[in-house]
Interface confidence: low
Amino acid sequence: MLRALWLFWILVAITVLFSKRCSAQESLSCDASGVCDGRSRSFTSIPSGLTAAMKSLDLSFNKITYIGHGDLRACANLQVLILKSSRINTIEGDAFYSLGSLEHLDLSDNHLSSLSSSWFGPLSSLKYLNLMGNPYQTLGVTSLFPNLTNLQTLRIGNVETFSEIRRIDFAGLTSLNELEIKALSLRNYQSQSLKSIRDIHHLTLHLSESAFLLEIFADILSSVRYLELRDTNLARFQFSPLPVDEVSSPMKKLAFRGSVLTDESFNELLKLLRYILELSEVEFDDCTLNGLGDFNPSESDVVSELGKVETVTIRRLHIPQFYLFYDLSTVYSLLEKVKRITVENSKVFLVPCSFSQHLKSLEFLDLSENLMVEEYLKNSACKGAWPSLQTLVLSQNHLRSMQKTGEILLTLKNLTSLDISRNTFHPMPDSCQWPEKMRFLNLSSTGIRVVKTCIPQTLEVLDVSNNNLDSFSLFLPRLQELYISRNKLKTLPDASLFPVLLVMKIRENAVSTFSKDQLGSFPKLETLEAGDNHFVCSCELLSFTMETPALAQILVDWPDSYLCDSPPRLHGHRLQDARPSVLECHQAALVSGVCCALLLLILLVGALCHHFHGLWYLRMMWAWLQAKRKPKKAPCRDVCYDAFVSYSEQDSHWVENLMVQQLENSDPPFKLCLHKRDFVPGKWIIDNIIDSIEKSHKTVFVLSENFVRSEWCKYELDFSHFRLFDENNDAAILVLLEPIERKAIPQRFCKLRKIMNTKTYLEWPLDEGQQEVFWVNLRTAIKS
């Protein structure tokens, strides 16, 4: 008993363990190409059941803590392994031994307090390695990366604990596309630590202080093409000559993000430029300038050494005392050769005229998200300002008058492109003046309701997206591209307005339809985006879309953005999938189809009637109904005649000479109805037949081969047969003048055939001795 109990508990434990392991396996979702997603599944270990078919495995945001040496052994073909934020604190030395094909490894934001070179030894194919956000102080006792000869991207360091960069750290790395080092708590930089990497395309350094900046700068001068400094307080930065020989630095771009500068430290930074003569781009993002712009480059040689800088970008520059800011006259000469300047979202309200005039080479100026108004813009764009300017972006400023803006910019003789989007303009006037070379105008998000001839006819590209336009009727003979999405247009604009239009984007309007004629009327249209409109899926629109498979070549957002708005039956269906209602769209086809079907039905019914004697049934029904409708002639209904005699003309001799003699001259005499004698002249034969049968007590059928062949006899038999069914009486008396084959009697006379089968008929005997008995029987039958 005790043993059985133990066995039971062991089985329960195995089941629980097995079910846990299985559930982990089940919650790993893999696609056909071997990409497996196991993010946020609460795994506490690497799941079992991994296979060589897996190419990518993402186990981020779990609680794995530990990776054992056999956990990943089955993943011989794994190329991507992502273990971000999985609380990993321990990795066995040979945990990655089978991952020779691995190209991407992300171990960021875990709890690895020390790093081991044995992890990376087998990873000869590795191109991307992210070790950032782990609480290590150094990169390990020995070099981590000597075998990673294919490495292109390396991210290391953390915010709090990574404090030392040593010479051995980057041994074996000769060339990197990206190197990111987060060392906000750096306390020691060993000289020449970064010098061993001969080529770094993009180096990002997160340094909180500038203490080691000069040493690092000296080491990377000959290797880095793009240096990005993040979160660095440069307020106390002081230049001192670098301990380097004459060097030709490949550095092309220098970016400061989240840095703090002062007027003085800016001057000091400028001195670094003498070492990077090829620098062409400088960028400041989210920086703070604790100063007034009182820059005073002390060394005259700095001025000429800034010569190759062509692009200066400043975004979200915070100047606490921006209202006291200097006119920058001290740096005018520094910027004479700059071609592109962006100063975005930095509270700019004026570019002094003299400064604008010094920007002789400037071709592109972006002053988006600032405080420019027409009054100050006039000063900025004074005579001789920005003489080479081709593109001006004044998006999201405080401009109000389109007319004034155009007039102010007339001084810019080379301006071809103007972006004044996201300004709230007054209603557009009828006429405006613009720089004569202007080809591109962006008026998106300006609240305009009507477009007028204020817009220049020289335009090749016009963007009026996200406004309140409900029509567009402006002739623009050179327009090649029209962006008019997010407005209220109900139809496509008239094609004759844009004879050379190539591209039109008219998404999110109120366009309900477009047709072959409309699209065909744009002679050069190559690209149309018209999705997310309120399409009425009419017969014409749907048949056009069904008949035009080439739509996908013109409509770049076809088919997913083209949905029916109405009729309700098709609401939400893609135009491509919507099928028009046959009732609504194919009435002619439907009517002709129904007619054809009816004709076929009639033919079918006709054929069936012919085959199953339907006409006979109809005639009988009609005759019967007629008979029913006639008023009963009271005195004569059952007593006019004792019997109606139905016979063939060929048997008239027997009837008239024998039967009539025997029955009408007997005692008591029988009154017989004969067609020759008693039918009403001028009355339809069939009516005579019906009337006679109706007025006779019995109907005597004189059957012979002649009778069966006679058409009128058949009618008489028809109606009598009908009466037999209807009234369920024995009104018919059959007299067989000669033997008839039963087959000769038509199928439809089922009762007659039954009577013949059951021998309830009188047979005319050829033996004269028996003929008297025949007459007695006939008289009895008529009387009954």
Partner: nanobody, 116 residues
């Protein structure tokens, strides 16, 4: 902003072929589409074709359809114009242009001369 540099122009015999490149740098992530234009002496700038950055779909002017092909290399942020069956009337300065939904950027142009 986006900077564009064209290259690959030069002298070529009629009937020959040439491949132009347009390398984009700067704010390339914002590019919506890129296009090729050309301008012959004394004539207006002419659209040749464009490529959408989102899905690589291309469009061509009738005059070059079938002879010119536009493609791009995503990794290099470069657009190409493969020109075949060149004619003397294809002689022009070839420009590339990018559009980011807000702003147009032009390259400096590269000269293509087709000799008969």
């Amino acid at each position: 902003e986006v900077q564009l540099v064209e290259s690959g122009g030069g002298l070529v015999q009629a009937g020959g072929s040439l491949r132009l490149s347009c390398a984009a740098s700067g704010r390339t992530y914002s590019i919506d589409s890129m296009a090729w234009f050309r301008q012959a002496p004394g004539k207006e700038r002419q659209f040749l074709g464009s490529i959408l950055w989102s899905d690589d779909s291309t469009n061509y002017a009738d005059s070059v359809k079938g002879r010119f092909t536009i493609s791009r290399d995503n990794a290099k942020n470069t657009m190409y114009l493969q020109m075949g069956s060149l004619k003397p009337e294809d002689t022009a300065v070839y420009y590339c242009r990018s559009w980011d939904g807000r702003q147009v950027y032009w390259g400096q142009g590269t000269q293509v001369t087709v000799s008969s």
